[in-house]
Interface confidence: medium
């Protein structure tokens, strides 16, 4: 059988091979479709209610003015030419409908790294056959059940039109330290071949990197906290909590008498500045959290170790809060 695909609602003409171009003709069409119990026979004489669905044209072709889902099936024509030679035509008709452009609804504007997040729901309406939805990350296909990707799919069929609505909900677990602005898109692939996929507009949620509550981050510049005499060290206390907590500083376990600030600068380091520093973040909602402690030490000239750029002028190694 020859495969024929026709778009729902469009006309379709099936040729009856070997039939004389005009009457009188000896031919018959046999149909086995969603509209028939078994085989339905149509002749050139026609007439009756079937004419609105399918009728034989003067040249012997079968004409369907508007193909519907029920017209899927087998169409056969048997024709005899003027010399009595018999020719058979055999068609398998499949119908299709391209849906509207798929859309991502309920899209997330922010994802949290390290935990499963719903990215959004992709919806395609009005397809036949159903087809499939697939997700893409930065243009590359996402494979469900791989690397923290899961997809929940749902297919519904319209009770009157018979067309399909597809839904696909994407859940991902973004990797920590990964792309802070990934691009997701969704595409609909038709169930019948030779038709292009339809892609949604992309979405670009922001990935938020949570730091566990107990992790108040203390960063030292230069790394290691070892500097030459007269060098400068900066200590930065970073807490991702919103609103920003108050940051206080401690040296050797004793609070420093300084106003709260996220950065502590130790200019023109002298022996009195050596010690162990930490910061304490005080949240309004939960109690204080202390960072790890870092050791600030002076490298005597000639010693190995990282150095900070020295600064001009002479000072007493006073603490400066930044």
């Amino acid at each position: 059988a020859q495969n024929i695909t026709a778009r729902i609602g469009e006309p379709l003409v099936l040729k009856c091979k070997g039939a004389p171009k005009k009457p009188p003709q000896r031919l018959e069409w046999k149909l086995n479709t969603g509209r028939t119990e078994a085989w339905k026979v149509l002749s050139p004489q026609g007439g009756g209610p079937w004419d609105s669905v399918a009728r034989v044209l003067p040249n012997g072709s079968l004409f369907l003015p508007a193909v519907g889902i029920q017209d899927e099936g087998i169409f056969r024509c048997q024709a005899m030419n003027r010399n009595g030679k018999e020719t058979k035509s055999n068609y398998r008709v499949r119908v299709y409908q391209i849906p509207g452009k798929p859309e991502i609804v309920d899209s997330a504007s922010e994802l949290t790294a390290g935990v499963p997040n719903k990215v959004g729901t992709c919806v395609s309406e009005g397809s036949y056959p159903a087809g499939t939805l697939s997700w893409h990350l930065d243009g590359k296909p996402l494979v469900p059940n791989e690397k923290g990707v899961s997809v929940k799919e749902q297919t519904r069929r319209h009770p009157e039109t018979g067309l399909f609505t597809l839904q696909s909900e994407l859940m991902v677990t973004p990797a920590r330290g990964g792309d802070p602005r990934p691009t997701f898109s969704c595409s609909f692939s038709p169930g019948l071949p030779r038709h292009r996929a339809l892609r949604t507009a992309p979405i670009q949620p922001r990935v938020w990197e949570p730091v566990p509550l107990e992790e108040v981050q203390l960063v030292v510049e230069p790394e290691g906290g070892a500097v030459a005499p007269g060098g400068t060290v900066t200590l930065t206390c970073e807490v991702p909590a919103q609103p920003s907590p108050q940051i206080h500083w401690m040296k050797d376990g004793v609070p420093l008498p300084l106003p709260p600030s996220p950065v502590l600068i130790l200019p023109e380091i002298g022996p009195q500045d050596q010690g162990t520093y930490s910061c304490v973040a005080t949240h309004s909602s939960h109690g204080p959290q202390e960072s790890r402690a870092v050791s600030i030490s002076i490298i005597e000239p000639g010693e190995e170790g990282p150095t900070a750029g020295s600064v001009g002028g002479s000072g007493l190694g006073t603490l400066a809060l930044a």
């Epitope: 990197e209 790394e223 930065t236 600030s261 600068i265 400066a320």
Partner: antibody, heavy 115, light 107 residues
């Protein structure tokens, strides 16, 4: 010596995105913060935010939270700033700056947003 | 946000003079203020941090002072190469904020 080499000037259309780079050399990239600063003619300097390449933590000025995305590539010692949904208000010179002390600045990159 | 106000947009001085550039913070920022110099067509250059500490290589004619809300950058014995715009910046609170700048003109 310490250097921050920024990418060349950019001319982009409104609504587009752009990613500008800042290549660090002469020091340990992962040991110092990289700040980004915006300068519009006659409008002074605005702090956008920082990234710490050592752990890829970021801190943004709320004003730029939905405009700028800061990233860093340790392997190439390069910090990046992506600016999205560009408008004429984003036309400016953008500087990258090393460290909380702000002791070294890149040469700046001129971004022009125009149709 | 903390507002850093440099009330004088322009200052005119002569070579050899002493000039004071002022900066006022809208709230207490301790000594967490830096000063930057920006020459035409160049990126800013760090001069002073922690209100009064000079960076390496900065001539000692540049002096910073102040704490709390009032800060001053003093340039003594002004040189022609000091023709530039000077910005203050606070880093006591996020977001870091800059003053609007003071342009120094040499007569």
């Amino acid at each position: 010596q310490v250097q921050l080499q920024q990418s060349g000037p950019e001319l982009v259309k409104p609504g587009a995105s752009v990613r500008i780079s800042c290549k660090a050399s002469g020091y340990t990239f992962t040991s110092y913060f990289i700040h980004w600063v915006k300068q519009r003619p006659g409008q002074g300097l605005e702090w956008i935010g920082w990234i710490y390449p050592g752990n890829v933590n970021t801190k943004y000025n709320e004003k730029f939270k939905d405009k700028a995305t800061l990233t860093a590539d340790k392997s190439s010692s390069t910090a990046y700033m992506q600016l999205s949904n560009l408008t004429s208000e984003d036309s400016a010179v953008y500087f990258c700056v090393r460290g909380q002390l702000g002791d070294y600045w890149g040469q700046g990159i001129t971004l022009t947003v125009s149709s | 946000d903390i507002v850093m106000t440099q009330s004088q947009k322009f200052m005119s001085t002569s070579v050899g003079d002493r000039v004071s550039v002022t900066c006022k913070a809208s709230q207490n920022v301790g000594i967490n203020v830096a000063w930057y110099q920006q020459k035409p067509g160049q990126s800013p250059k760090a001069l002073i941090y922690s209100a009064s500490y000079r960076y390496s290589g900065v001539p000692d004619r540049f002096t910073g002072s102040g704490s709390g809300t009032d800060f001053t950058l003093i340039i003594s014995n002004v040189q022609s190469e000091d023709l530039a715009e000077y910005f203050c910046q606070q880093y006591n609170n996020y977001p870091r904020t800059f003053g609007g700048g003071t342009k120094l003109e040499i007569k």
